[in-house]
């Protein structure tokens, strides 16, 4: 049928709560295109009737709520004037208990996120809520170890939980809960987050300087291999850690299963006044999901990012 196939990473989701996935393919969906969702290679498109439990909402597929039988491969077909792309998304639905629901704890959780707070700093956690405009998201509540979070150090601001003066006790299991309203009906969204604490790097004031990257984008073709160096200068006696992170998680942990994106071995060159450190990130194969995501190089308290973007089409 002339459509180019693109495979996205698996999404693992919890039953009994809303879920939505947006069909975006940056070089195409910005223009005049039509988007149609299908399930398991069916020839019949997903319904566009908003009363349907599963329906297409503009470029999104929306589940209100997700159910056991919804596991499978979904395709969204993006048709432009001269192009056709079929994006495959593998959704796996499972039952997850964060607290013992029989004793009045929180209900089932969606896929756990891993997030990091920095010891001794003001930092924040994010409640990831990705839904179309037709879904109105209500007040967010945050829980730690099944208890609602209260106290001077914590502030719920939009989708974030601001944490001031992070301490070792802040590690643990968190959850954020939001009420989603769609066509007059209310649903509960609950995301679990495993929080670890990282030491504030360095003693007494050496602030590493990240020479490269410089908070910029890099044009790279889909499917290619890419290696990006993070170059850092720091004092000779520093104790700062240098690493690459994505979504607030070490890339080696985030891509633990596929090993598609890895952090390299750190090297350094010694100068009289300072050291120059290099640690690279390797993309064995650039995938669609990598575009638009900030890949952060951390060096002590310093950070800098790269964002991958598709090259502009060459119309020559």
């Amino acid at each position: 049928d002339g459509c180019k196939d693109i495979f996205m990473k698996n999404e693992i989701l919890s039953a009994s709560q809303p879920f939505a996935f947006n069909c975006t393919f940056p070089p195409i969906t910005s223009g005049e295109v039509s988007v149609t969702w299908y399930k398991n290679s069916s020839k019949i498109p997903v319904s566009k009737i908003i009363q349907s439990r599963i329906h297409q909402d503009e470029t999104w597929i929306l589940f209100l709520p997700m159910e056991w039988g919804d596991s499978g491969v979904y395709q969204c077909v993006i048709k432009g004037r001269d192009s056709c792309h079929r994006i495959h998304v593998n959704l796996t639905v499972f039952e997850k208990h964060w607290c013992d629901t029989s004793i009045g704890g929180l209900p089932n959780l969606s896929d756990e996120y891993k997030q990091i707070l920095h010891l001794g700093k003001d930092d924040s956690l994010t409640c990831h809520l990705h839904f179309p405009k037709s879904c109105v998201l209500g007040p967010i509540k945050w829980y730690k170890d099944c208890n609602e979070i209260k106290g001077e150090r914590f502030t719920v601001l939009e989708t974030r939980l601001l944490v001031s003066n992070v301490s070792a006790e802040d590690r643990g299991n968190y959850a954020c809960q939001a009420i989603l309203t769609h066509s007059g009906k209310q649903y509960e969204v609950l995301n679990g987050i495993t929080v670890s604490i990282t030491e504030r790097a360095g003693y007494g004031g050496s602030v590493p300087k990240i020479i490269y990257p410089k908070n910029h984008s890099i044009e790279v073709q889909l499917g290619t291999t890419l290696i990006v160096d993070c170059n850092v200068t720091d004092t000779k006696d520093n104790t700062n850690l240098r690493c690459w992170r994505v979504n607030n998680t070490l890339v080696d942990d985030y891509y633990d299963e596929s090993k598609r994106i890895r952090e390299g071995v750190e090297t350094h060159v010694s100068f009289r006044e300072h050291n120059l450190y290099t640690v690279n990130i390797t993309f064995l194969e650039v995938k669609m999901e990598d575009y638009g995501l900030p890949f952060m190089c951390h060096a002590g308290v310093s950070t800098a990012y790269i964002i991958l973007q598709l090259p502009a089409p060459d119309f020559r």
Epitope: D122, T155, L157, E158, R160, L162, N215, N248, P294, Y305
Partner: antibody, heavy 120, light 112 residues
């Protein structure tokens, strides 16, 4: 539609206190932070703090922590900001402001402003 | 506290011409969640401020599409593609990455 209506202008002596009210309508009052921002004559904007009507949690700019008290009356959907130990540099227009939504930040809704003049 | 620095202090523009205002933050406003917690406001004479742009590049409701926002984690630009008479006022940048929320000093835009 969302509306924030503030109390009228005040003239106060140095050392006195002023209490400015902000009456909210058109949304669920207890779902949103109410922010207070002030603007001295021909000056920029300065965030003073925010108050959550559901639980009376207050987050203040450290600059105002000893002088500002925020309270609410849920029966009338009104938030109050009291500034004590007034000095001449507190002469400003005081605004209450609410975010765009519970998910998206930025102050999309503002009161009309209350001019507080501190003069001996 | 995060310091927001705006340039220029004032700007005189011919109607129909483009205009550009810059703002720099003392700390990157790009969160690890990929959201940039940066905002633009316009305060017209005698009025409270109005939100123009949220999260660096999103147009607020009711704002004409001649306004656009862009930037990196620390350097931001507000562009007006064709300035109109109603665009006069003081433009402020702001951050809400962390408390206290802070504003830039403002850029006054007037019509030539």
């Amino acid at each position: 539609q969302v509306q924030l209506v503030q109390s009228g202008a005040e003239v106060k002596k140095p050392g006195a206190s002023v209490k400015v009210s902000c009456k909210a309508s058109g949304y669920t009052f207890t779902n949103y932070w109410m922010n207070w921002v002030r603007q001295a004559p021909r000056q920029g904007l300065e965030w003073m703090g925010m108050f959550h009507p559901s639980n009376a949690v207050t987050r203040l700019n450290q600059k105002f922590k000893d002088r500002v008290t925020m309270t609410r009356d849920t029966s009338t959907s009104t938030v109050y900001m009291e500034l004590s130990s007034l000095r001449s540099e507190d002469t400003a227009v005081y605004y209450c402001a609410r975010t765009t939504s519970m998910i998206i930040g930025g102050f999309a809704y503002w009161g009309q402003g209350t001019l507080v003049t501190v003069s001996s | 506290d995060i310091v927001m620095t705006q340039t220029p202090l004032s700007l005189s523009v011919t109607p129909g011409q483009p205009a550009s205002i810059s703002c720099r933050s003392s700390k990157s406003l790009l969160h690890s969640n990929a959201i940039t917690y940066f905002y633009w406001y316009l305060q017209k004479p005698g009025q409270p401020p109005q939100l123009l742009i949220y999260q660096m590049s999103n147009l607020a409701s009711g704002v004409p599409d001649r306004f656009s926002g862009s930037g990196s984690g620390t350097d931001f630009t507000l562009k007006i593609s064709r300035v109109e008479a109603e665009d006069v006022g003081v433009y402020y940048c702001a951050q809400n990455l962390e408390l206290p929320l802070t504003f830039g000093g403002g850029t006054k835009v007037e019509i030539k």
